[in-house]
């Protein structure tokens, strides 16, 4: 039995002393306006949709809507006694961008579209960001333009940051033991979570822990290995706190950012810094995905916050923390890329759309300049004597690059007889050629290596 605590006294006339769920009338499976509580606060009923009449005998408005009379006064007991009907109006009036790439006039319209979508057994529409899908919006009064309140930002976003744990099976007993952990962040109230693809590698069992300690088994919904983004889902009753995606394209070098993660149960780790470079060419950093840019930051990104959000001072996600790839330099996958991934993921699930293939060898690299070469030489005594080429930061396991014998710290100096000056040169050749005969400087040796790019889903 439910108590009626919290129900306002004027509405209590004719209501039972105690709520009895068994007495509630059966409800249809789908409600156009979403669900609401009846006047007594006892039963869940179908709420009236936006624009529908409310008050009097009309019943309550649906989720996120409020009953407003013609002069804009919210309906109350007094209004009801004067026998005036109101209209259901969305409590939120700003436009929002949905994961289906549509702009909705307000949050209520997006929720209505999401309910329609689910009724048709399509994926729900989730909020990607405040404001219209295509446009920028600069708010000069926002925190990010006025203050550096890191703790406020953390307090605001922490509830939507989750701890992700992976389990492996022991070889013979097949018992599951924890093997690794990372972070992620919630992007939809019904439990969609974004993290790094590398956090959920190899079909391990994935467990998610929320800030309140609740744990859930997660299903992997979609993965983009190259972009290193994964979408996982937990089944949670009730609404979860979510983070909205900002526009990474609007980031300015020098802007404060906060990297947050949840490396341990019930605990967050926070690092802060500035944006060093806003659109560091993925072609340079090398790439799982040659046409992707990264955000470079001096905020420390490590195993603890990998997969978690990199946020601006408004608490909007402007990137996913990805691992630190070399001392003093950390990278994040930009939110614009996450939006693209979420929109395409929504599309794929809705339409089962075919995917065009891309060529891939499996390295992260960066263009070597004389200053970068000097910096690396100072750090590593055995760094090769070269001042240009493509410097390999990481060789991804089980890829053509690894099979061919490429190694971290190699410098690619030529491919198929053509000299390589930058990481772009490598990306261009990968697109064109089916076999790559590379000359690689390793230490002070030149080594011949053959790599056969593979075609993979983008």
């Amino acid at each position: 039995q439910l108590s009626r605590a919290g129900r306002s006294a004027p509405l209590a006339a004719g209501c039972p002393d105690r709520c009895e769920p068994a007495r509630c009338p059966p409800q249809p499976e789908h409600c156009e306006g979403g669900r609401a509580r009846d006047a007594c606060g006892c039963c869940e009923v179908c709420g009236a949709p936006e624009g529908a009449a409310c008050g009097l005998q009309e019943g309550p408005c649906g989720e996120g809507l409020q009953c407003v009379v013609p002069f804009g006064v919210p309906a109350s007991a007094t209004v009801r006694r004067r026998a005036q009907a109101g209209l259901c109006v969305c409590a939120s009036s700003e436009p929002v961008c949905g994961s289906d790439a549509n702009t909705y006039a307000n949050l209520c319209q997006l929720r209505a579209a999401s309910r329609r979508s689910e009724r048709l057994h399509r994926p729900p529409v989730i909020v990607l960001q405040r404001g219209a899908c295509g446009q920028g919006q600069e708010d000069p009064n926002s925190l990010r333009h006025k203050y550096n309140f890191i703790a406020d930002v953390v307090e605001k976003i922490a509830p939507a940051v989750v701890h992700i744990e992976l389990f492996r099976k022991l070889p013979f007993s097949k018992r599951e033991v924890p093997v690794a952990s990372g972070s992620g962040f919630i992007v939809s109230e019904d439990g969609l979570i974004v993290t790094n693809a590398h956090v959920v590698t190899n079909k391990h069992r994935v467990k998610v822990e929320l800030k309140n300690g609740a744990t859930y088994e997660a299903k992997i919904k979609d993965v983009d290995e190259k972009a290193d983004i994964a979408l996982i889902k937990i089944d949670h009753q009730g609404k979860l706190p979510v983070l909205l995606l900002g526009r990474s394209s609007e980031l300015r070098p020098g802007e404060f950012v906060v990297a947050i993660g949840s490396p341990f149960s019930l605990q967050n780790t926070v690092t802060t810094g500035i944006v060093s470079t806003t659109q560091r060419g993925g072609k340079e950093l090398g790439l799982r995905n040659s046409d992707m840019d990264y955000i470079q930051t001096d905020a420390i990104i490590n195993y603890g916050n990998s997969g978690g959000p990199l946020v601006n001072l408004d608490g909007e996600v402007i990137g996913i923390n990805t691992l630190k790839v070399t001392a003093g330099i950390s990278f994040a996958i930009p939110s614009d890329k996450i939006k693209k991934f979420l929109t395409e993921s929504h599309d794929r699930q809705a339409k089962g759309k075919a995917i065009t293939k891309k060529k891939y060898i499996g390295i992260r690299m960066m263009s070597l300049t004389s200053s970068k070469a000097k910096e690396l030489k100072d750090r590593h005594r055995d760094f090769p004597d070269v001042i240009s080429g493509a410097y390999i930061i990481e060789v991804i396991p089980d890829t053509p690059a690894e099979a061919g014998g490429l190694k971290e710290n190699d410098v690619i100096i030529s491919i198929n007889g053509q000299s390589v000056v930058s990481a772009n040169d490598v990306s261009d050749v990968i697109k064109r050629e089916s076999t790559l005969n590379m000359v690689v400087r390793r230490g002070n040796e030149d080594i011949m290596i053959t790599v056969i790019p593979e075609e993979i889903d983008p």
Epitope: R168, F172, R175, V177, P397, D398, G405
Partner: antibody, heavy 123, light 105 residues
């Protein structure tokens, strides 16, 4: 740091049994299987079997089935390997070794080894 | 059972030489592992998942291959590399190659 320390050398008569111990430290004993591998003089390494210390579940090489028993004492973080009905060809160095796991590739291997225990079977 | 054939069974090389050991298996495996064993000592893991260097292992050691044929290489032989090297696979259960004894000329 991870350490596996084995019991000392043994000399046994044919038909007898031997029990070798392996004390683990520096990691959570129940998070990894413990395996036993032997090496007869001039021979290749030979896997004998394994135990999950948490559950006591075991797996054995068919070649030794019925003669080898692997056990573990969680509270003492110690694994044991007992080989019965000894014969001269069981003369070998017996190693305990921890199962390692590659997070990236999902492969298994042996990452830490005990110092070895020489068991000599002679009449 | 998977049969493993490691070759050569012994080899002699000079300091600075490039040394290559091969391991063939009777049916395809996902990964190969390589160990170094010095006289009177336990084996030590050098290479995991075919080509990944184990922690603290010098970069002169490397591994490659796939399916049924795998290779272990020392790019420039050092005196301390004198040992016996074993390959190992782990499909249904672990098995080892017969070993390659490496000596200095």
């Amino acid at each position: 740091q991870v350490q596996l320390v084995q019991s000392g050398a043994e000399v046994k008569k044919p038909g007898a049994s031997v029990k070798v111990s392996c004390k683990a430290s520096g990691y959570t004993f129940t998070d990894y299987e413990m395996h036993w591998v032997r090496q007869a003089p001039g021979q290749r390494l030979e896997w004998m079997g394994a135990i999950d210390p948490e559950t006591g579940g075991t797996a054995y090489n068919q070649k030794f089935k019925g003669r080898v028993t692997i056990t573990a004492d969680k509270s003492a973080s110690t694994a044991y390997m007992e080989l019965s009905s000894l014969r001269s060809e069981d003369t070998a160095v017996y190693y305990c070794t921890r199962e390692g796991y590659s997070y990236e590739g999902g492969g298994y291997y042996f990452d830490y080894w005990g110092q070895g225990t020489l068991v000599t079977v002679s009449s | 059972d998977i049969q493993m054939t490691q070759s050569p069974s012994s080899l002699s090389a000079s300091v600075g030489d490039r040394v290559t050991i091969t391991c063939s298996v009777s049916s395809s495996v996902s990964y190969m592992y390589w160990y170094q064993q010095k006289p009177g000592k336990a084996p030590k893991l050098l290479i995991y998942d075919t080509s990944n260097l184990a922690s603290g292992v010098p970069s002169r050691f490397s591994g490659s291959g796939s399916g049924t044929d795998f290779t272990f290489t020392i790019s420039s032989l050092q005196p301390e590399d004198i040992a016996t090297y074993y390959c190992q696979q782990w499909s249904s259960y672990p098995t080892f190659g017969q070993g390659t004894k490496l000596e200095i000329k």
